[in-house]
Amino acid sequence: VPRWRQQWSGPGTTKRFPETVLARCVKYTEIHPEMRHVDCQSVWDAFKGAFISKHPCNITEEDYQPLMKLGTQTVPCNKILLWSRIKDLAHQFTQVQRDMFTLEDTLLGYLADDLTWCGEFNTSKINYQSCPDWRKDCSNNPVSVFWKTVSRRFAEAACDVVHVMLNGSRSKIFDKNSTFGSVEVHNLQPEKVQTLEAWVIHGGREDSRDLCQDPTIKELESIISKRNIQFSCKNIYRPDKFLQCVKNPEDSSCTSEI
């Protein structure tokens, strides 16, 4: 690694990043025929243009606007599932409940899911060695700004009843510093969104506590109510059974509480 290269605290760009983004884009247009008009080469060019040759601590939402424009997508606004610290279950759910969407079920979320990227000021190189860490280096890095931008837009698009899946195993079930807590909650539009319904996912088999009474959930309820949006909360005591019942709602065991 050349000496002059800035060393950041976070992992570097995911290997084969350009190839991965392009392959995912083409795959998405295959899986989602309604997006087949998308020009994946142009999408990659816009993605690249957002961070290449720019200081990776000085990225703005404006940098991502060309990509946002190309990735414009209409999802049913009343079928949105937000999540916080429980991505895998949220994605398993939307894979079964095909009419509901997480951010990662949209083109832009699908492209970037689990990837890291950054460039370097004044060079066209992608930095595969290290990228800024949100805490240790800077918050205005390419990855954080991307997720902030797409999360804001996703939340702004939501209407009617919005669902959010929260991890009941964590000390902070609702975390104000998460993307959900810091971006999505504040960008739900009260004139469009009637209710935010939280699903608190239990981790332990024998955990029968009502986690909807958790202080952090009460904090979420307070924030939401102040924004003139109704709040409701459900405990999901058995996530495995919950998924099974989404797959087979007629199953006789699915009438009891899950």
Epitope: V26, K27, T29, R36, D39
Partner: antibody, heavy 115, light 107 residues
Framework: QVQLVQSGAEVKKPGASVKVSCKAS????????IDWVRQAPGQGLEWIGL????????KYNEKFKGRVTLTADKSTSTAYMELSSLRSEDTAVYYC????????WGQGTLVTVSS | DIQMTQSPSSLSASVGDRVTITCKAS??????VAWYQQKPGKAPKLLIY???YRSSGVPSRFSGSGSGTDFTLTISSLQPEDFATYYC?????????FGQGTKVEIK
Amino acid sequence: QVQLVQSGAEVKKPGASVKVSCKASGYTFTNYLIDWVRQAPGQGLEWIGLINPGSGSTKYNEKFKGRVTLTADKSTSTAYMELSSLRSEDTAVYYCAKTGTLPYWGQGTLVTVSS
Amino acid sequence: DIQMTQSPSSLSASVGDRVTITCKASQNVGTSVAWYQQKPGKAPKLLIYSTSYRSSGVPSRFSGSGSGTDFTLTISSLQPEDFATYYCQQYGSYPLTFGQGTKVEIK
């Protein structure tokens, strides 16, 4: 510039198979899906299926499933459509097309099925 | 499969006329509709995608509208080079399907 060049016209007997090629140039072959569409003489357009040249995965119109096979050779940037158990109603011009906001189509390949 | 019913199947018009072609989908396809123009012996050419977006190089006299199940292609002022057959296509779900075509002829 972008070009999709298809193989020449074919005359086949009923029950035979035909393989039509579509050579792409002027763009990165793996960055776009390739559709196959046919048009019987004096008739409308009918979608046969598509291939993702990067992964090789395919989607077929149920009407053709079991009779059509779509493949792609990344090394030569060529897509292929093979149709088997040909019958007279398969007589048509077969087109390949690259997807996107500015799609490009091949010039078409006339396949005539006649005994 | 989603059926696309196009009307009329043919029409006669003069240069300068405003021409409207409609397409009805058998189920909701959102805005996932494209319009193609085809001239004899040639491959189809994309005019409109996502209901109302013109493809690159397509003249502004071509416009599309609609959503859900009802879609329209309008040629605001017919030019000599516009005499051709027009097809709608839905790409909201597989298999992709086309309308049966509308032939625009010289009056």
